[in-house]
């Protein structure tokens, strides 16, 4: 399977997950595929603590996360429940804005310059963050 006991080179370990931060931009789907080929997924933010960690690393730059509503309801790419989970939207977001003139609404979520979330056109070339969880078994203390 895909279990890991330590983070790959150039990834950052934090709270039993590994994170990789791009330095360039891709459309949301291309960023998603990049992460999947690396046995990871676009970052799923489950707490305020994780939000602050990611925000610290990305700085004030629009950055894709693993949250979208391309098929209707908002969904996290790893199956984490959206409705009951952590959220950090900007005021009046998400708004599925159609006024950008690019066709359709806004179906992909990103961190904005202040870290809060916005929905935007999935084709925009934003930076992205991949995340992969470390082997859950390795959290158990060794048997004596």
């Amino acid at each position: 399977g895909s279990e890991r006991t330590c983070c790959p080179v150039n990834w950052v370990e934090h709270e039993r997950s590994c994170y990789w931060f791009s330095r360039s931009g891709k459309a949301w789907a291309d960023a998603d595929n990049y992460c999947r080929l690396e046995d990871a997924h676009l970052v799923v933010v489950t707490s305020w603590e994780e939000q602050k960690f990611v925000q610290h690393h990305i700085g004030p730059v629009n950055t894709w996360m693993g949250l979208h509503d391309q098929n209707g309801p908002w969904k996290w790419v790893d199956g984490t429940d959206y409705e009951t989970g952590f959220k950090n939207w900007r005021p009046e977001q998400p708004d599925d804005w159609y006024g950008h003139g690019l066709g359709g609404g806004e179906d992909c979520a990103h961190f904005t310059d202040d870290g809060r979330w916005n929905d935007d056109v999935c084709q925009r070339p934003y930076r992205w963050v991949c995340e992969t969880e470390l082997d859950k078994a390795s959290q158990e203390p060794p048997l004596l």
């Epitope: 399977g1 895909s2 790959p8 360039s24 931009g25 891709k26 595929n33 990049y34 080929l37 690396e38």
Partner: antibody, heavy 121, light 107 residues
């Protein structure tokens, strides 16, 4: 450094099946994404499929989707391409390549020497 | 799918010549472009990735440039071992696609 060597090519009738193998040397195989690229005789290169290091995530060109299956056995350091419902247009040299991650994207390096698949009656 | 085109399809040159090959993508691919060299009967070899980064072990006479849709591979002083076919490839999005190739022949 990973080195790769393909095998399993040969002559097969249209509608038939074939499984290609790619043996890799190098201690990082289980964490390396891998890919298949093909080249029809006298033609250019065509990406076929890719797979993540664990084998959990796979990607296919539309031309082979539903007919070809990429897989890997990390305990044997081996990559596979199961080819079903073969057509004349699948005739090509099939190359195995490591997917090299750098500068926020993926590149093919190194490549194997290729194995020839001929689909003909 | 992103279509890749190359020009010229073939070029005749002499040892010591400067050779330039161009590659164009049907839509913007930022700097996600690679160049490969293939000799007859051999596997392709990665020369340049991320549009301008020279792969380890590749001679410095090879260089790449460009961004967006237009890219260039330059061989500053052609050597006998450089006669081959050169392919560009976009690594921006699936399906990864290659250009049709440019054959560099001896004049």
């Amino acid at each position: 450094e990973v080195q790769v060597l393909e095998s399993g090519g040969g002559l097969v009738q249209p509608g038939g099946s074939l499984r290609l193998s790619c043996a890799a040397s190098g201690s990082t195989f289980s964490s390396d994404a891998m890919s298949w690229v093909r080249q029809a005789p006298g033609k250019g290169l065509e990406w076929v499929s890719a797979i993540s290091g664990s084998g959990d995530n796979t990607f296919y060109a539309d031309s082979v989707k539903g007919r070809f299956t990429i897989s890997r056995d990390n305990s044997k350091n081996t990559l596979y391409l199961q080819m079903n419902s073969l057509r004349a247009e699948d005739t090509a040299v099939y190359y195995c390549a490591k997917v090299y991650s750098a500068y926020d994207s993926h590149w093919f390096d190194p490549w194997g020497q290729g194995t020839l698949v001929t689909v003909s009656s | 799918d992103i279509q890749m085109t190359q020009s010229p399809s073939s070029v005749s040159a002499s040892v010591g010549d400067r050779v330039t090959i161009t590659c164009r993508a049907s839509q913007g691919i930022s700097s996600w472009l690679a160049w490969y060299q293939q000799k007859p009967g051999k596997a392709p070899k990665l020369l340049i990735y991320a549009a301008s980064s020279l792969q380890s072990g590749v001679p410095s006479r090879f260089s790449g440039s460009g961004s967006g849709t237009d890219f260039t591979l330059t061989i500053s002083s052609l050597q006998p071992e450089d006669f081959a076919t050169y392919y560009c490839q976009q690594a921006n999005s699936f399906p990864w696609t290659f250009g049709p190739g440019t054959k560099v022949e001896i004049k």
